[in-house]
């Protein structure tokens, strides 16, 4: 699951994982 950047109830920032694929596979060899 991807989280979005924002402020949670304990005032900690939520790291945005949205720059990375959720279930990545290896790049196809060409």
């Amino acid at each position: 699951s991807e989280t979005t950047t924002g402020t949670s109830s304990n005032s900690s920032q939520s790291t945005s994982n949205s720059g990375l694929a959720p279930n990545p596979t290896n790049a196809t060899t060409k």
Partner: antibody, heavy 115, light 112 residues
Framework: EVQFVESGGGLVQPGGSLKLSCAAS????????MDWVRQASGKGLEWVAE??????????YYAESVKGRFTISRDDSKSTVYLQMNSLKTEDTAIYYC??????WGQGTLVTVSS | DIVMTQTPLSLSVTIGQPASISCKSS???????????LNWLLQKPGQSPKRLIY???KLDPGIPDRFSGSGSETDFTLKISRVEAEDVGIYYC?????????FGGGTKVEIK
């Protein structure tokens, strides 16, 4: 304020080991996918390893160049991610950054592998 | 591995003028969920990198709107509408669609 603070770098001989730590604060660490990225002096960025969160079964991924030698782990109770580096080579010499999925970055810790 | 190729290698820009950096990937970055995991990062002199943009065009919090990202599949562009002195550094594109994550070689932006 979000802070990632790396430690554990230093000078080590080829074949030796080091364990890097990255302590996070100001961030919901348990939700973060944590990565290590390195940068040799005057060079570009190279991804090293990643560990995902509990909902993703703490799955780990590694660059081919470190697979079998480096191990990434995390302790959510301490908001800390680790990189155990074994069988170090001279080409592993670099500044090692920890980053929350490329979002927040630490200041880096220098690892020098030399005899 | 997906190879990320950035051009130009360096860029000298007058303050207030626009700047553009190109990033091309050796394979499509379009992921099966319809999203494209292309990021832009800036490493200012003596500092650690900082992400500016994720998923091609989404600005990270606190990033000025003079920065914009565009592109699809294999061709991407970072644009700065009006360069400011604080924008100097090395800009990297990075793909997060297929393992291993890979970075472009960087584009050094300096003030003319």
């Amino acid at each position: 304020e979000v802070q990632f603070v790396e430690s554990g770098g230093g000078l080590v001989q080829p074949g030796g080991s080091l364990k890097l730590s990255c302590a996070a604060s100001g961030v919901t660490f348990s939700e973060a996918w944590m990565d290590w990225v390195r940068q040799a002096s005057g060079k570009g960025l190279e991804w090293v390893a990643e560990i995902r969160d509990k909902p993703n079964s703490y799955v780990t991924y590694y660059a081919e160049s470190v697979k079998g030698r480096f191990t990434i782990s995390r302790d959510d109770s301490k908001s800390t991610v680790y990189l155990q580096m074994n069988s170090l080579k001279t080409e592993d010499t670099a500044i090692y950054y920890c980053t929350g999925a490329m979002d927040y970055w630490g200041q880096g810790t220098l690892v020098t592998v030399s005899s | 591995d997906i190879v990320m190729t950035q051009t130009p290698l360096s860029l000298s820009v007058t303050i207030g003028q626009p700047a553009s950096i190109s990033c091309k990937s050796s394979q499509s970055l379009l992921y099966s969920n319809g999203k494209t995991y292309l990021n832009w990062l800036l490493q200012k002199p003596g500092q650690s990198p900082k992400r500016l943009i994720y998923q091609v065009s989404k600005l990270d919090p606190g990033i000025p709107d003079r920065f914009s990202g565009s592109g699809s599949e294999t061709d991407f562009t970072l644009k700065i509408s009006r360069v400011e002195a604080e924008d100097v550094g090395i800009y990297y594109c990075m793909q997060g669609s297929s393992l291993p994550w890979t970075f472009g070689g960087g584009t050094k932006v300096e003030i003319k």
